[in-house]
């Protein structure tokens, strides 16, 4: 796969993952009422990071925000923080990677600068993805713990906190947002890895040039204003290909601003 394709694909995959992280963070269905082996209720409860909702059989849905910071469990706060960190890093990663894309020319930015930016965005995407995966996994672990702790007849109020009336304990299981979050985090992570791989292709390694011998014969040395350009072609007028490029260049590539590696 060419560097441009790897970089572009990494960017697109990260972008999809990032969108998924935002979607998961905003979704209300992080935990949903467990319907298995429970008395069948005409009310369905589900909860997100920011509010809890109740949907009645009648179709009426009521959501209430968590209008407190101090009263919320520390784990929930931690999950919120991890998801926000993931989003923030993702935003920065996207902005950096836009400038790093090989197919986009900005001023006289050379490939080494693009390589550094590609690496930076890749690392940002990796951390963003990991942050989201950890956040979702922490929440999932919290659900599993609470699920086994809750019993059919237990004093419960707001999701098991407070209240003094015996109710059928509402048990919660994994909601759709968890699966969206895991997949999105994974995609962001994969996209980040692809960006880092693309960076390796963008970064020239001097050792690649040491083994190459240049035969300057009259037929393949052409005068160019600004310097002599050697060609490894035998009697052809093809331009020299960068050894680290991994294949034929596109027309756009050929017209890109010459870098110090273009000159012998």
């Amino acid at each position: 796969m060419s560097v441009t394709a790897c970089q572009g694909l990494g960017f697109v995959v990260s972008l999809i993952g990032f969108a998924g992280i935002i979607a998961a963070t905003c979704m209300d269905q992080w935990s949903t009422q467990d319907l298995y082996n429970n008395p069948v209720t005409a009310v369905f409860n589900y909860q997100g990071l920011w509010r809890s909702c109740v949907r009645e059989s009648s179709g009426f849905t009521e959501c209430r925000g968590y209008f407190t910071l101090l009263g919320l469990p520390a784990m929930l706060q931690a999950v919120r923080a991890l998801m926000i960190v993931g989003i923030v890093l993702g935003v920065i990663g996207i902005l950096v990677s836009i400038f790093a894309l090989k197919c986009i020319r900005i001023g006289s930015m050379d490939d080494s600068a693009k390589a550094k930016m590609t690496l930076t965005s890749g690392i940002l995407f990796i951390i963003s993805g990991i942050s989201a995966i950890i956040g979702v996994s922490v929440f999932a672990n919290m659900l599993v713990t609470n699920f086994w702790m809750s019993t059919a007849n237990m004093y419960s109020g707001m999701g098991g906190m407070g209240g003094m009336v015996q109710t059928v304990q509402t048990r919660y299981t994994f909601g759709a947002a968890l699966f969206v979050g895991w997949v999105a985090g994974g995609l962001t992570l994969i996209g980040g890895v692809m960006m880092c791989i693309a960076c390796r292709g963008l970064t020239p390694d001097d050792s690649n040039f040491k083994a190459v011998s240049y035969h300057a014969s009259g037929q393949n040395v052409a005068y160019r204003p600004g310097g002599f350009k050697a060609s490894t072609g035998f009697g052809s007028n093809t331009r020299n290909k960068k050894i680290y490029d991994g294949g034929a260049r596109t027309e756009d590539d050929e017209q890109s601003h010459p870098t110090k590696y273009d000159y012998v």
Epitope: Q33, P39, V40, T41, A42, V43, N45, Q47, S52, C53, V54, E56, S57, S58, G59, F60, E62, R64, S156, G157, M158, G159, G160, G163, V165, Q166, T167, V168, Q169, T170
Partner: antibody
Framework: QVQMKESGAELVKPGASVKISCKAS????????MDWVKQRPGKGLEWIGQ????????NYNGKFKGKATLTADKSSSTADMQLSSLTSEDSAVYFC???????????WGQGTLVTVSA | DIQVTQSPSSLTVTAGEKVTMSCKSS????????????LTWYQQKPGQPPKLLIY???TRESGVPDRFTGSGFGTDFTLTISSVQAEDLAVYYC?????????FGSGTKLEIK
């Protein structure tokens, strides 16, 4: 305004079947559950079941499974209840009712009297 | 199924009096998600279909006179009529609106002297 108009009284023989209709108007028929309630003469209320006209989903009271079959036709905004293998125990007034806030029966039909007699 | 028990089965009062009737459920009708009690009260006058009075145990349906008040929590609920009027002659039913199948109480018959 919301209205529920039920079909007229029925006199049927034991063992036969009967179909009661409830035509709704004044609201989006397919987006609300339609419930059916039985009331025997001088007795209390019994919930039979409900149907969601939007997709045909149903919930039945176990006691009426096999006895009542609920259907709905979105095009005519009509809900039907078929009662089969009728006995004297099935002689009652049957109400259709629309589910509303708090899973309460907000709007009711006027009731259909079904009399099972030889 | 959830059992809903109403008491008394009948009440005879004079106009202007305050009346309370009770409804008990075999399981709590409190939903922890929104802290609402899924108990409903209906009024049924002779020859008419039931009419919704109160839902969520204490929320009065629009158009229902404010002399009707619902209260209670969990398993024990009460319907209060602060000043009974002649037109309040009816049977009052409470209903479990939380668990399937929905179940009704046997009713409290209110008679006016």
């Amino acid at each position: 305004q919301v209205q529920m108009k039920e079909s007229g009284a029925e006199l049927v023989k034991p063992g036969a079947s009967v179909k009661i209709s409830c035509k709704a108007s004044g609201y989006a028929f397919s987006t609300y559950w339609m419930d059916w309630v039985k009331q025997r003469p001088g007795k209390g209320l019994e919930w039979i079941g409900q149907i969601y006209p939007g997709n045909g989903d149903t919930n039945y009271n176990g006691k009426f499974k096999g006895k009542a079959t609920l259907t709905a036709d979105k095009s005519s905004s009509t809900a039907d209840m078929q009662l089969s293998s009728l006995t004297s125990e099935d002689s009652a007034v049957y109400f259709c009712a629309r589910l509303g806030y708090g899973n309460s029966f907000t709007y009711w039909g006027q009731g259909t009297l079904v009399t099972v007699s030889a | 199924d959830i059992q809903v028990t109403q008491s008394p089965s009948s009440l005879t009062v004079t106009a202007g009096e305050k009346v309370t009737m009770s409804c008990k459920s075999s399981q709590s009708l409190l939903n922890s998600g929104n802290q609402k009690n899924y108990l409903t009260w209906y009024q049924q006058k002779p020859g008419q279909p039931p009419k919704l009075l109160i839902y969520w145990a204490s929320t009065r349906e629009s158009g229902v006179p404010d002399r009707f008040t619902g209260s209670g929590f969990g398993t024990d609920f009460t319907l209060t009529i602060s000043s009974v009027q002649a037109e309040d002659l009816a049977v009052y039913y409470c209903q479990n609106a939380y668990f399937y199948p929905f179940t009704f109480g046997s009713g409290t018959k209110l008679e006016i002297k």
